[in-house]
C-alpha cells in the first residue's frame, strides 16, 4: 500500500493576510485566522512529517480584497509560488479581469501547473493561451506518480468575463477522455481537482470512470467528521464518500473558503491504484499556528502599496451620496441606486442574442449601507470612502429565485417599516410600490421588473412562477436581515465579486457620477 497526503484549499478569494473568524479584516490579531504565512507554517510542518504530500488549490484565488484590486493576480502567483503549490484548477473568478488578466499575472508567472479540462480555446486566443493551462498534469510524488485533472464551472461565462474565445464544456463529458488518456499513460492514481460546486463534485465522483478522489471548490462547502472547531456547520462528513457507477468508493472533499482551513486528506492506494482507505479533516488555521516569519515579512512588504492605493481618487461625484440610515432604511436613497447600478454593470454579459443581458435586477438591504459620501470634498471618492460605506467585506452574488420568493422578500422589506431596521430594500431594475396602510405581508401593491429577453428594456409585472436572476449581497443570499425565504427558496447561488471592488470599478469607469432618486421605490395612498 502507498499513502498520499492531499492538502487543499479553495475559494481563498484574496485572503493573503490573516482575517477575523468571519473572514473579514483582522482586528484582534490574537483571534485571527488563515493567511498565507500561517498556511505555510502548517504546510511545511506536514511536508516535514509525511513522505508523499501534494498541495492543491481548487480555484477562485482571485477576487475578494484590496489585494486583488491592486495587484490583479500578481499576488496570487507570487505567494502560491512561495508556498510551492503543486497544482491549481481554474475557478470562475480567475476570469474576472478577462483572459489577459489571467494570462499575464498568473498563467505566465505560476511555477505550478494550472488546470482545466473543460475549457477549450478557439480563434486567435487558442495559440496565445494553449499550453499555459493544461487539461491534466502527471506529478511525481515520492516513488509514484499521481494524475491531476482539472475542471471549471461551465457557468463561468455568466459569472465572470472569459470572453467569446473560450468554450466551457460540460465537466463530465470533458473529463472522461482526459482521464482515459491518463490511464493509457499507465497513471492509475487520479485526482479530479476543480471548481464547479459540491453537487458537480459528487456527480464527477459518480460518473467519471477512473477518478479516485475529487477535490472541489466554488460552493464553499464545509465538511467535517466529529465536532467542528469553529462556526461553520458541516454539510457532511469529511471526506464525503460517493459510490461510483462502477462500484468504487470515491472520497470527495472541499475546505470551506477564505483560507480559514487547510484541507487534510490521507489516501491509501493499493498497487493497482485503487483507494483502500481515506480519512482526514480540515485543519482550522487559528492563532495557535504561528505565521511563518519570512512569508509574513514578504506580506508586509507587499502591503505598502495597498495603503497608498486606499487614498487615491477613483472618480468624482457631483452630488451628495446619501448613504445615511435615515434615508436608506426608509426610502429610496441615491447611494443605494449607485450601488445597485454598479452591481448590474458588473454583471453585463452578452452571452445570448435573445437577451440584452442575463440579469437586470438588484436588491440590497439598506442596513448594509453604512455611510454617506459628501461631494464637498472636491467630489473625490477613494477606496477608503467606499470602505466606510461597505465595511463588511461581502460579495455581490448572483442568485436565481422564483417571482413568488421575490414578492415575499419585498413584503419582508416593509413588514415592520418605520423602525429604522436594515431589511428595507434598495433596488435596481425593479419598480416597487408599497401601501403601508395595509397589514404586514400584504403591503406590496405593485412590483414591476426590467425584462432581460428584450432588445429595448422595459418594466413588466413580476410573474410569480417565473424564475429570475437577481444580484444581491451574499448577506441576503445567506438569509441575513431575516430574508430566510431567499436562503430557503433560492434555486441557484453563485458567489460574486467583492462589494467595494464592484462599486470602485464602476466609479472608475464612469469617472463622474450623479445618481438620483428617481422613483424606483414608491409609497401609495399618501402614507409617504
Amino acid at each position: 500500500a502507498w499513502e498520499l497526503t492531499i492538502l487543499h484549499t479553495n475559494d481563498v478569494h484574496s485572503r493573503l493576510e490573516q482575517t477575523s473568524e468571519d473572514s473579514s479584516k483582522c482586528v484582534n490579531a490574537s483571534r485571527c485566522m488563515g493567511g498565507v504565512a500561517r498556511l505555510f507554517t502548517k504546510v511545511q510542518q506536514i511536508r516535514r512529517a509525511e513522505p508523499n504530500v501534494l498541495l492543491l488549490d481548487a480555484g477562485d484565488q482571485y477576487q475578494g480584497t484590496i489585494w486583488f484590486t491592486v495587484y490583479k493576480g500578481a499576488e496570487v502567483a507570487h505567494f502560491m509560488n512561495a508556498l510551492r503549490y503543486d497544482a491549481m484548477a481554474l475557478g470562475n473568478h480567475e476570469f474576472d479581469n478577462g483572459v489577459e488578466g489571467l494570462i499575464e499575472p498568473l498563467l505566465k508567472e505560476a511555477k505550478f501547473p494550472i488546470l482545466s479540462a473543460n475549457i477549450k480555446a478557439k480563434g486567435p486566443l487558442a495559440s496565445q493561451i494553449s499550453g499555459l493551462y493544461l487539461p491534466y498534469k502527471v506529478l511525481p510524488v515520492g516513488d509514484e506518480v499521481v494524475g491531476i485533472v482539472g475542471y471549471t464551472s461551465k457557468e463561468t461565462p455568466f459569472l465572470s468575463n472569459p470572453g467569446t474565445n473560450l468554450v466551457f464544456e460540460d465537466e463530465i463529458t470533458a473529463l472522461q477522455p482526459e482521464v482515459d488518456k491518463l490511464k493509457t499513460l499507465n497513471v492509475n492514481k487520479i485526482i479530479a481537482l476543480g471548481h464547479s460546486g459540491f453537487e458537480m463534485d459528487k456527480l464527477i465522483a459518480q460518473k467519471v470512470r477512473g477518478v479516485d478522489v475529487v477535490v472541489g471548490g466554488h460552493s464553499n462547502t464545509f465538511l467535517y467528521t466529529g465536532n467542528p472547531p469553529s462556526k461553520e456547520v458541516p454539510a457532511g462528513k469529511y471526506p464525503f464518500i460517493v459510490t461510483s457507477d462502477d462500484g468504487r468508493k470515491v472520497p470527495v472533499v472541499q475546505a470551506y473558503a477564505f483560507g480559514k482551513y487547510l484541507g487534510y486528506l490521507k489516501i491509501e492506494f493499493d498497487e493497482r491504484g485503487n483507494v483502500i482507505s481515506s480519512h482526514g479533516n480540515p485543519i482550522l488555521l487559528n492563532s495557535s499556528i504561528p505565521e511563518d516569519p519570512s512569508i509574513k515579512a514578504d506580506i508586509n512588504k507587499w502591503r505598502i502599496k495597498l495603503d497608498n492605493y486606499s487614498t487615491q481618487e477613483l472618480g468624482k461625484t457631483i452630488v451628495y451620496l446619501d448613504g445615511s440610515s435615515q434615508s436608506c432604511r426608509f426610502r429610496e436613497c441615491n447611494m443605494g441606486n449607485l450601488i445597485c447600478d454598479a452591481m448590474i454593470n458588473n454583471n453585463l454579459r452578452h452571452t445570448d442574442e435573445m437577451f440584452w443581458n442575463h440579469v437586470s435586477m438588484c436588491i440590497l438591504n439598506g442596513g448594509g449601507i453604512r455611510s454617506p459620501i459628501d461631494e464637498r470634498n472636491n467630489g473625490t471618492i477613494t477606496w477608503e470612502n467606499l470602505a466606510a460605506v461597505l465595511p463588511f467585506g461581502g460579495t455581490f452574488d448572483l442568485v436565481q429565485l422564483k417571482g413568488s420568493t421575490l414578492k415575499k422578500a419585498f413584503e419582508h422589506s416593509v413588514h415592520r417599516y418605520g423602525q429604522s431596521t436594515g431589511e428595507f430594500l434598495q433596488v435596481g431594475g425593479i419598480h416597487v410600490v408599497y401601501d403601508l396602510s395595509r397589514k404586514p405581508g400584504d403591503r406590496v401593491v405593485k412590483l414591476d421588473v426590467l425584462c432581460t429577453k428584450c432588445r429595448v428594456p422595459s418594466y413588466d409585472p413580476l410573474k410569480m412562477d417565473e424564475v429570475y436572476k437577481v444580484i444581491l449581497p451574499n448577506f441576503l443570499a445567506n438569509g441575513g436581515d431575516g430574508f430566510q425565504m431567499i436562503k430557503d427558496e433560492l434555486l441557484r447561488h453563485d458567489s460574486g465579486d467583492q462589494d467595494i471592488n464592484v462599486v470602485s470599478t464602476y466609479i472608475s469607469k464612469m469617472k463622474v457620477i450623479y445618481p438620483a432618486v428617481e422613483g424606483r421605490i414608491k409609497f401609495s395612498t399618501g402614507s409617504h
Epitope: 487558442a126 494553449s130 493544461l134 506518480v145 482515459d180 493509457t184 499507465n186 492509475n188 498497487e271
Partner: antibody, heavy 117, light 107 residues
C-alpha cells in the same frame, strides 16, 4: 544518472520470435514507465507501447497489439519486449526509453533486429 | 491518432547560421510535446520538453516555442555538433506519434 543497456543485435528467421532486454540502472526502476520505439528508414520512429514496472500495467499502440509483448523483471530492473511471428517488416532498430511524463528522457542504445531466411 | 507533420524534411546550413524546424499537430496537444536530436547510428536524445523547456545539458542556442498545434525548434549559431536528424513528438495520451524527421546537413 539513469542508464539503459539493451541486448545485442538479432538475426532471426521469418515466423520466429525474439525477446530483447533493456537493463535499467541509476534510478528507481519501478517509478518510471518504460517505452519501446521502432525505427526504420521508411517509417521513421514509431511508438510500440509502454509498461509501468511498478505494477506491470501496459499500454500498446493498436498497430503492435499481438506483435509485441512487454514484461518486466523487477528483481533485475530489466524490461523485456518479445516480438512474435516475425516478417521482414519487423526488421528495424528497437529502442527502450524511460518516460517521466514530460518526455522520453533517457534512451537505450538500440537493438537491431534483422528478419531473413 | 494525432498526426505530427514536420518540415522541412531536410535542410542544408552552414556553421554560425540560424535554422528553424517546425512541427504541426493534427489537433490541440497543449504543450505535451518534445523535440529530439539523433546522430547517425545513435539513439535519440531529448532536447526540449513541454514545448519550450530545455533538457538538462542542452546548450542555450536551442530554443523551443509554440503550443496547441504549432511548434518550432530554433537553433541559433549552428555548431558542427548540431548536424544530424531532429524529431518532434507528442505525448497527449497514446499512441505517441513522432514527426517524420528533419535531416540537418552541413552546406
Amino acid at each position: 544518472q539513469a542508464y539503459l543497456q539493451q541486448s545485442g543485435a538479432e538475426l532471426v528467421r521469418p515466423g520466429a520470435s525474439v525477446k530483447m532486454s533493456c537493463k535499467a540502472s541509476g534510478y528507481t526502476f519501478t517509478s518510471y514507465n518504460m517505452h519501446w520505439v521502432k525505427q526504420t528508414p521508411r517509417q521513421g520512429l514509431e511508438w510500440i507501447g509502454a509498461i509501468y514496472p511498478g505494477n506491470g500495467d501496459t499500454s500498446y499502440n493498436q498497430k503492435f497489439k499481438g506483435k509485441a509483448t512487454l514484461t518486466v523483471d523487477k528483481s533485475s530492473s530489466t524490461a523485456y519486449m518479445q516480438l512474435s511471428s516475425l516478417t521482414s517488416e519487423d526488421s528495424a532498430v528497437y529502442f527502450c526509453a524511460r518516460y517521466d511524463y514530460d518526455a522520453m528522457d533517457y534512451w537505450g542504445q538500440g537493438t537491431s533486429v534483422t528478419v531473413s531466411s | 491518432d494525432i498526426q505530427m507533420t514536420q518540415s522541412p524534411a531536410s535542410l542544408s546550413a552552414s556553421v554560425g547560421e540560424t535554422v528553424t524546424i517546425t512541427c504541426r499537430a493534427s489537433e490541440n496537444i497543449y504543450s505535451y510535446f518534445a523535440w529530439y536530436q539523433q546522430k547517425q547510428g545513435k539513439s535519440p536524445q531529448l532536447l526540449v520538453y513541454n514545448a519550450k523547456t530545455l533538457a538538462e545539458g542542452v546548450p542555450s542556442r536551442f530554443s523551443g516555442s509554440g503550443s496547441g498545434t504549432q511548434f518550432s525548434l530554433k537553433i541559433n549559431s549552428l555548431q558542427p555538433e548540431d548536424f544530424g536528424s531532429y524529431y518532434c513528438q507528442h505525448h497527449y495520451g497514446t499512441p505517441f506519434t513522432f514527426g517524420s524527421g528533419t535531416k540537418l546537413e552541413i552546406k
